[in-house]
Interface confidence: low
């Protein structure tokens, strides 16, 4: 069966493209200018020597996906440059399967297995060379290319060191068994970035976890800077297709960011789902629950299909600083269901944050501790104080009359008033816990349109500190 596949591989199906090889391995050496002639071919050792292929170094294979243009896109050149900058001695090979990828999507999907087999044959041949080790091989596949990488890892004799799936394609792969898509069995370590997943309409990227660790930046769906307004602002003809491209391709740019901005690494946190992450529940680094993203992701034992989440900026560098905030809202009377809008401003030794809204994922729990996630784009340094604001809302005359009557019967406590004594904060990036208290223990109440200040009053929450990601991932 493999021979049949191999036979069908050599050329694209019809037309002028039939003369061209359907899969080409373009070896991109960082030694000197790029040379068109550096194409690798099974059984031909000369190009390896001509182009200074380093048998003992890391070898990256970059695999593109389905294409509308029929050309190698800009992201690929950026990724090649970033890899060469980060790993100066490494071999970078671009797997060019354009004649098969620039077809109907369904036809391109049907070619992924055969392209994966071609990559596996190349790896099998290279394994016969002195010094070459599969453990040093890192396959990086974008969209359909991620599944090509999976097939290559499945077909190769031995185990590839690592596969990175950059928003693996969803249509025709979602929900299928592990032998028909990228899966954790395809390499020693499979890490995946999901940036265009949708639970409604068509999901261009695969929603299900398919690696050892599966990272969902911004929940894996709406990427900052990719809204229609953002896209319209940055190009002359913004379309839904541009939004799709922006979000789908964001996975590549996050990976490039992890290569070039080594001093600003982003961290992801293990969580069962996006909603729990949005609540700020999942900012722990205990038991390998946090990890670097992109190139900085590290293999951890016994993890498989582990979902991890983080927030990002709209552009490079993508790193943000995550904080968990725990606030206990005391209510001295039954106020019914309230939906307050709270904002916080964080003040640190380096800077102060913008005004950050506390996203209420479900509903405020009264006389209960509520957890929130906030994140800042700048490094604030050590936190010193917090300003909490309850946004005033317009109310009807009836509401005001009720509040006035309530005040007459109980002058000290107007309706829709809450009491907050302290805010507990945990930094995702440093894993430091801090407690912030009101200045005057007698003045803890807040009502719509008012603000309350909290000052650092304790290191920790009276609990032992957890490991910080910077320690764990260095």
């Amino acid at each position: 069966a493999e021979e049949q596949l191999e036979g069908g591989l050599r050329t694209a199906k019809d037309g002028p493209a039939a003369a061209k090889a359907a899969v080409r391995f373009h070896f991109r050496t960082s030694k000197g200018p790029e040379r068109e002639g550096c194409y690798l071919s099974v059984g031909h050792s000369q190009p390896l020597e001509d182009c200074s292929f380093n048998m003992t170094a890391k070898t990256f294979f970059i695999i593109h996906g389905w294409t509308m243009s029929g050309m190698l896109e800009n992201w690929l050149h950026k990724l090649v440059s970033a890899l060469q900058m980060r790993e100066k001695d490494a071999n970078v090979v671009v797997v060019d399967w354009l004649p098969l990828a620039h077809q109907l999507y369904t036809d391109a999907v049907n070619s992924t297995r055969v392209v994966g087999l071609s990559v596996a044959k190349m790896l099998d041949w290279l394994q016969g060379k002195d010094g070459f080790s599969l453990g040093n091989v890192h396959l990086i596949g974008y969209s359909l290319g991620a599944h090509v990488a999976g097939f290559a890892g499945n077909f190769v004799k031995g185990t590839v060191g690592r596969i990175t799936g950059l928003d693996p394609a969803g249509p025709m792969f979602e929900g299928v068994d592990i032998h028909r898509r990228l899966s954790p069995d395809d390499a020693d370590f499979v890490d995946v970035l999901h940036t265009y997943t949708r639970s409604f309409g068509i999901s261009i990227g695969i929603q299900m976890p398919v690696g050892h660790i599966d990272i969902y930046p911004n929940g894996g769906d709406f990427q900052p800077g990719c809204g229609l307004n953002d896209v319209l602002g940055s190009i002359a003809y913004g379309t839904i297709a541009e939004v799709v491209k922006c979000e789908h391709e964001r996975a590549v740019h996050l990976f490039v960011d992890s290569l070039v901005n080594q001093d600003k690494p982003s961290f992801a946190f293990q969580c069962t789902d996006s909603n729990r992450f949005k609540k700020g529940i999942c900012l722990s680094c205990r038991k390998n629950r946090c990890n670097g993203i992109g190139y900085n992701a590290k293999k951890t034992r016994n993890k498989r299909n582990t979902k991890m989440y983080l927030k990002t900026r709209a552009g490079m560098p993508f790193r943000v600083y995550h904080y968990q905030m725990k606030i206990h809202f005391f209510s001295y009377k039954s106020v019914g269901a309230i939906e307050p809008t709270f904002y916080v401003t964080l003040y640190g030794t380096n800077a102060e944050s913008q005004v950050l809204s506390l996203e209420i994922v479900e509903q405020i729990g009264l006389n209960a501790t509520n957890t929130f996630l906030v994140y800042t784009e700048e490094d604030l340094g050590d936190l010193l104080k917090i300003k909490l604001t309850w946004e005033g809302t317009s109310r009807s005359w009836y509401d005001l009359w009720r509040e006035f009557r309530s005040y007459l019967s109980q002058p000290h406590r107007p309706e829709r008033e809450l009491s907050i004594r302290r805010i507990r904060v945990k930094s995702g990036e440093t894993q430091r816990r801090l407690t912030f208290c009101v200045e005057d223990p007698e003045k803890t109440s807040i009502a719509p349109g008012q603000e309350l200040w909290f000052y650092k009053c304790r290191d920790g929450w009276r609990m032992k500190n957890e490991t910080s990601p910077t320690v764990e991932l260095s």
């Epitope: 199906k13 002028p16 509308m68 243009s69 029929g70 004649p99 620039h102 109907l104 491209k245």
Partner: antibody
Framework: EVQLQQSGPELLKPGASVKISCKAS????????MHWVKQSHGKSLEWIGS????????SYNEKFKDKATLTVDKSSNTAYMEFRSLTSEDCAVYYC????????????WGQGTTLTVSS | ENVLTQSPAIMSASLGEKVTMSCRAS?????MYWYQQKSDASPKLWIY???NLAPGVPDRFSGSGSGNSYSLTISSMEGEDAATYYC?????????FGGGTKLEIK
Amino acid sequence: EVQLQQSGPELLKPGASVKISCKASGYTFTEYTMHWVKQSHGKSLEWIGSINPYYGGTSYNEKFKDKATLTVDKSSNTAYMEFRSLTSEDCAVYYCARYGNYVGYFDYWGQGTTLTVSS
Amino acid sequence: ENVLTQSPAIMSASLGEKVTMSCRASSSVHYMYWYQQKSDASPKLWIYYTSNLAPGVPDRFSGSGSGNSYSLTISSMEGEDAATYYCQQFTSSPYTFGGGTKLEIK
């Protein structure tokens, strides 16, 4: 606005050849595959084949392989379908259709070209 | 080739009535696509990826199915829905269409 403007109706004799055109506007011509579909009078639709304008790669329905030839002229954003050795079986409306954005379906169709073959 | 069989070939429905038409494939397909065609007009994309409505298609339309069996449903028939509906597959070449279901107003 995306438009596919097809050439006018054709009346030809059996054995002749015809070249139908489909001029695309409102989008980047080379970024979308162009397909051709046949609809005989009162009948269903039949896929003839497709052409990738970027490098001219074609794909045909086996049934039409000896009948149709698909070409493009990138300079004028026009796709062509040539039909040879015409018979009465070829009497039909022929549509060009753009294979749509990102993952694929026929999102825009030409208005159709009616081909009549009669002696 | 994958033969798509649509049923019924012709059907009529009263305004406000629920309408369901089906499309069976001789071999399993990944997704089904539906097109609407009115007389003397080109087909229009109506439903893509089995259940997604094309822009401008009223939400009374819905699509469903998997494997070999797919259907298009109109929750409440309106006059403008009278047309012929074709199903189509892209899973394997040649890309085939069903014979069509002609929907008329009763």
